[in-house]
């Protein structure tokens, strides 16, 4: 009689994570008597996957009634497959004895597991940055298999090219992770902008996963300041305004200084929003000129989002009739209230 052969017809089987894998095995003879066992891997470190007669294998079921004496089909089904189950599975025939001895092994079936990548997580810099600066964004996705994966970066729908991507580990693994860092140059118009990381993988059937970051979390647009003197409202009264424009985020504090002395401090509250997402704010002072013998230097000082203060000054002539004059310094923050100086 022809010697028993162990036939594993499938060289490889690919299964999606969470599904069941069927591993086929048949033998060509009932002789010699002895059990069939399934192992993952070969050699002394091989892992027992299924023993016909004893042990606990809750995820494994036999496809046919393998314990029937005349049965020659020893195919198994492994449920709830995870990437950790990947490997080569061997169907092995043992000869009964003391102890049982390995008689013949099948050629093996390689099980590969298709696992979806996790939703990409995009994170930006810890601190805000101003326009014209370059900031880095990272994108991470984990747990996918096989290793081949494509990652793209977009800013407002426009593909970015300045990025570096790594897939780990480099060698064979049950699953993989991807890490990418993109560099983005900020502009003053980026408050409403988004950075998108897009991951494409065979398991996603052409429907890539996306992770986003809003540049509103990253950008700081410093304000521009303009101090102007309005026409006389009443005899000896001058209205001086400080226009704080195009700033983001809203957190801003404005201080009026009169000849270097603090006159009033206020916090931006009722701001107007521009189309690009930045804010404008205005604060004013009502100055009683007759109370002053000398010229008055009025300074609008703005502290924006915890940054060093910027200011702009205006020289108010007291000697003759007031004329509109101004002198520039710098700018940052808002307020809107009025105050008379006597």
């Amino acid at each position: 009689e022809e010697e028993l052969q162990v036939i594993q017809p499938d060289k490889s089987v690919s299964v999606a994570a969470g599904e069941s894998a069927i591993l086929h095995c048949t033998v060509t003879s009932l002789i010699p008597v002895g059990p069939i066992q399934w192992f993952r891997g070969a050699g002394p470190a091989r892992e027992l996957i299924y023993n016909q007669k004893e042990g606990h294998f809750p995820r494994v079921t036999t496809v046919s009634e393998s314990t029937k004496r005349e049965n020659m089909d020893f195919s198994i089904s492994i449920s709830n497959i995870t990437p950790a189950d990947a490997g080569t599975y061997y169907c092995v025939k043992f000869r009964k004895g003391s102890p049982d001895t390995e008689f013949k092994s099948g050629a093996g079936t390689e099980l590969s597991v298709r696992a979806k990548p996790s939703a990409p997580v995009v994170s930006g810099p810890a601190a805000r940055a101003t326009p014209q600066h370059t900031v880095s964004f990272t994108c991470e996705s984990h747990g996918f298999s096989p290793r081949d994966i494509t990652l793209k970066w977009f800013k407002n729908g426009n593909e970015l090219s300045d990025f570096q991507t790594n897939v780990d580990p480099v060698g064979e693994s049950v699953s993989y992770s991807i890490h990418s860092t993109a560099k983005v140059v900020l502009t003053r118009e980026d408050v409403h902008s988004q950075v998108i990381c897009e991951v494409a993988h065979v398991t996603l059937q052409g429907d890539p996963l996306r992770g986003t970051a809003n540049l509103s979390e990253t950008i700081r647009v410093p304000p521009t300041l303009e101090v102007t003197q309005q026409p006389v409202r009443a005899e000896n009264q001058v209205n001086v305004t400080c226009q704080v424009r195009k700033f983001y985020p809203q957190r801003l504090q404005l201080t009026w200084l009169e000849n270097g002395n603090v006159s009033r401090t206020e916090t931006a509250s009722t701001v107007t929003e521009n189309k690009d997402g930045t804010y404008n704010w205005m604060s004013w002072l009502l100055v009683n000129v007759s109370a002053h013998r000398d010229d008055v230097k009025l300074t609008c000082q703005v502290e924006h989002d915890g940054q060093p203060a910027v200011s702009k000054s205006h020289d108010l002539k007291v000697s003759a009739h007031p004329k509109e004059q101004g002198s520039n310094t710098a700018a940052e923050n808002t307020g809107s209230n009025e105050r008379n100086i006597y």
Epitope: V33, P44, A45, R46, E47, L48, Q52, K53, E54, G55, H56, T67, R69, K96, S98, P99
Partner: antibody, heavy 113, light 108 residues
Framework: EVQLVQSGAEVKKPGATVKISCKVS????????MHWVQQAPGKGLEWIGR????????KYAPKFQGRVTITADTSTDTAYMELSSLRSEDTAVYYC??????WGQGTLVTVSS | EIVLTQSPATLSLSPGERATLSCSAS???????LYWYQQKPGQAPKLWIY???NLASGIPARFSGSGSGTDYTLTISSLEPEDFAVYYC?????????FGQGTKLEIK
């Protein structure tokens, strides 16, 4: 549902023989090895042996070899463990188990003169 | 015969503490063939961990198993009152199958 129901407690005299049964349900006894384990009072577990009910092939621990006989009746889905030449140190609870995963409730055998 | 030696013989701990139970084999045991059982007084042993690190059905995730070759460990991350019992390691890598002598986990 897998169940293993063992026969009741036994009191035996030294030198006698005891035969304990283990009736299984929820599976076909031919499909699995049936093991027997001893636990003396306040002591640990000790493997006695096992049977393959499909062909009656047995394996025994050296300590029990020659005094123990494990059998199975596939028509009634019942496994048996017979221990002869009983001595006081054989006083113990005896468990049957299916393939190392499911256990019977145990049978207390007391050997006393 | 493979001799399994468990240590300590008795472990006295309080609920909430971490427990580490060891099982040392006199010769190498494949991790697939190393099981742990829990036994409470008057009850049959229950399969607790199979193939070194896999929890049997219904076993809480605070339990874990690890090891290879001759050294195996059962760990309970934070003890609950119902965890106090005797734990046995068991090898069925080669005949005769053997059990460790057990570790009694008792409330301090």
């Amino acid at each position: 549902e897998v169940q293993l129901v063992q026969s009741g407690a036994e009191v035996k005299k030294p030198g006698a023989t005891v035969k304990i049964s283990c009736k299984v349900s929820g599976f076909n006894i031919k499909d699995y090895y049936m093991h027997w384990v001893q636990q003396a009072p306040g002591k640990g577990l000790e493997w006695i042996g096992r049977i393959d009910p499909e062909d009656a092939e047995t394996k025994y621990a050296p300590k029990f070899q020659g005094r123990v006989t494990i059998t199975a009746d596939t028509s009634t889905d019942t496994a048996y463990m017979e221990l002869s030449s009983l001595r006081s140190e054989d006083t113990a609870v005896y468990y049957c188990d299916r393939g190392l995963a499911y256990w019977g409730q145990g049978t207390l055998v007391t050997v006393s003169s | 015969e493979i001799v399994l030696t468990q240590s300590p013989a008795t472990l006295s701990l309080s609920p909430g503490e971490r427990a580490t139970l060891s099982c040392s084999a006199s010769s190498s045991v494949s991790s697939s063939y190393l099981y742990w059982y829990q036994q409470k007084p008057g009850q049959a042993p229950k399969l607790w961990i199979y193939s070194t690190s896999n929890l049997a059905s219904g076993i809480p995730a605070r339990f874990s198993g690890s090891g290879s070759g001759t050294d195996y460990t059962l760990t309970i991350s934070s003890l609950e009152p119902e965890d106090f019992a005797v734990y046995y390691c068991h090898q069925w890598s080669s005949y005769p199958y053997t059990f460790g002598q057990g570790t009694k986990l008792e409330i301090k």
